[in-house]
């Protein structure tokens, strides 16, 4: 009877990008008073863990702590809620959460094609490159939940590169990029050195408000 109840939420604290051997806590929660949560991990081994729900202030939740992150635990996780002792009466699944292990390979370089200081409205492109033969690059922006990703272009001057067009500049931000290989999408390189992009000729240089929807990975977006 999957989907009897609406889906719970699944969060990662402090975040879904986890350094090797560091701790991450996965939290299932819902405003439905679930007695149990089932945490499911997709991967070579499909694993399901049954967690007891705790009820506080009209919310049910359960935490799963990974004390030392390894490559074997990276993957796509989903959470289900259960209101009875029957494991078959579960809610719809939470949105998938990709837990990625970072810091495994050498860091790529990140640069802004027109330099890190740009005029408001100017089109910004960030380039991520490495001598390592990464198949994919991931660009993250501080304060945003999702990364953009692009395949690495063919080897040029001994490097593999991806160019991220961010559109017209409005607000600055701090960016990082990571490299990964096709066969291990949940295993990323060390972070590039952070790149602070500043926008001049703009009355404000604030962060996006918390209510602003963050773009999904891979969609074109403006530089906020």
């Amino acid at each position: 009877h999957e989907g009897v109840h609406r889906k719970p939420s699944l969060l990662a604290h402090p975040g879904r990008l986890v350094k090797s051997e560091e701790t991450v806590i996965l939290q299932c929660w819902s405003d439905v008073m679930f007695e149990h949560f089932l945490l499911h991990r997709e991967g070579m081994f499909n694993d399901t863990l049954r967690l007891i729900g705790e009820h506080h202030d009209g919310v049910s939740k359960a935490n799963f702590s990974i004390s030392r992150m390894t490559q074997d635990l990276a993957g796509t996780y989903r959470c289900y809620g259960s209101v009875t002792h029957s494991p078959y009466q579960v809610s719809a699944p939470s949105d998938p959460l990709d837990i990625v292990i970072i810091g495994l390979y050498e860091k790529p370089s990140l640069s802004a094609q027109l330099g890190p200081t740009v005029l408001a409205g100017e089109n910004v492109t960030l380039s991520c490159s490495s001598r390592s033969s990464y198949d994919m690059y991931h660009l993250s922006r501080e304060g945003e939940a999702h990364e953009r990703r692009l395949p690495a272009g063919p080897k040029v001057n001994g490097t593999f590169q991806a160019d991220f067009p961010l559109g017209p500049a409005t607000h600055g931000g701090t960016y990082r990029c990571f490299g990964s290989f096709h066969d291990s999408p949940y295993e990323w390189s060390k972070s590039s050195d952070p790149l602070l992009v500043s926008v001049t000729g703009n009355p404000s240089n604030s962060w996006p408000s918390p209510t602003e929807p963050s773009s999904k990975t891979g969609n074109p977006r403006h530089l906020h």
Partner: antibody
Framework: QVQLVQSGAEVKKPGSSVKVSCKAS????????ISWVRQAPGQGLEWMGG????????NYAQKFQGRVTITADESTSTAYMELSSLRSEDTAVYYC??????????WGQGTLVTVSS | QSVLTQPPSASGTPGQRVTISCSGS????????VNWYQQFPGTAPKLLIY???QRPSGVPDRFSGSKSGTSASLAISGLQSEDEADYYC???????????FGGGTKLTVLA
């Protein structure tokens, strides 16, 4: 340096069960998969199944489904493989191996199980 | 009968380059990466190559791996007498939902 130490050789009668242990030392036990791989005399390698201790859910090769049980005890950093309804073809060296990404960089020394009447 | 197919034997003289093939299908080698193991008599296998062509630390660069379609190969250049061993390929199989191995190749280094 992670080490996997397995229990000693066993001689079993057909129809009985055997339980082999694999104790890990020198690293995080819970966060790495432990697989069991067997090798019959003069034969190749055969994956039987595996478990990630922190989850506790075992995954089995179709061939062994219903006959093998893989468990893990986080408190003692030990994984177990129990094979039931033994027959002479189950005579083999049984290895535990750690990790799936990359696969099996660390192996136990192997446990010889002989099934004979 | 192994899911992955390897030649039962291979040989070469010291200094030579030898290759060992491993043939599979779309559900294993075709969609997943290939790993190679080296095994000496009476000892546990040792990971030699993972993710098609990656060497764990401590494995000499004389060993290299490659993959194309549903086949893979292990190449050993500058063959040495201590390379005489059994070699196994392995890959995850999406249909069987488990690891599958080749039958193994016995490498002989001729004097």
């Amino acid at each position: 340096q992670v080490q996997l130490v397995q229990s000693g050789a066993e001689v079993k009668k057909p129809g009985s069960s055997v339980k082999v242990s694999c104790k890990a030392s020198g690293g995080t036990f819970s966060s790495y998969a432990i697989s069991w791989v067997r090798q019959a005399p003069g034969q190749g390698l055969e994956w039987m199944g595996g478990i990630i201790p922190i989850f506790g859910t075992a995954n089995y090769a179709q061939k062994f489904q219903g006959r093998v049980t893989i468990t893990a005890d986080e408190s003692t950093s030990t994984a177990y493989m129990e094979l039931s309804s033994l027959r002479s073809e189950d005579t083999a060296v049984y290895y535990c191996a750690r990790g799936v990404r990359p696969p099996f960089p660390t192996w136990g020394q192997g446990t010889l199980v002989t099934v004979s009447s | 009968q192994s899911v992955l197919t390897q030649p039962p034997s291979a040989s070469g003289t010291p200094g030579q380059r030898v290759t060992i093939s491993c043939s599979g299908s779309s559900s294993n080698i075709g969609s997943n990466t290939v790993n190679w193991y080296q095994q000496f008599p009476g000892t546990a296998p040792k990971l030699l190559i993972y993710s098609n062509n990656q060497r764990p630390s401590g494995v000499p660069d004389r060993f290299s791996g490659s993959k194309s379609g549903t086949s893979a190969s292990l190449a050993i250049s500058g063959l040495q007498s201590e390379d005489e061993a059994d070699y196994y390929c392995a890959a995850w199989d999406d249909s069987l939902n488990g690891w599958v191995f080749g039958g193994g190749t016995k490498l002989t280094v001729l004097a």
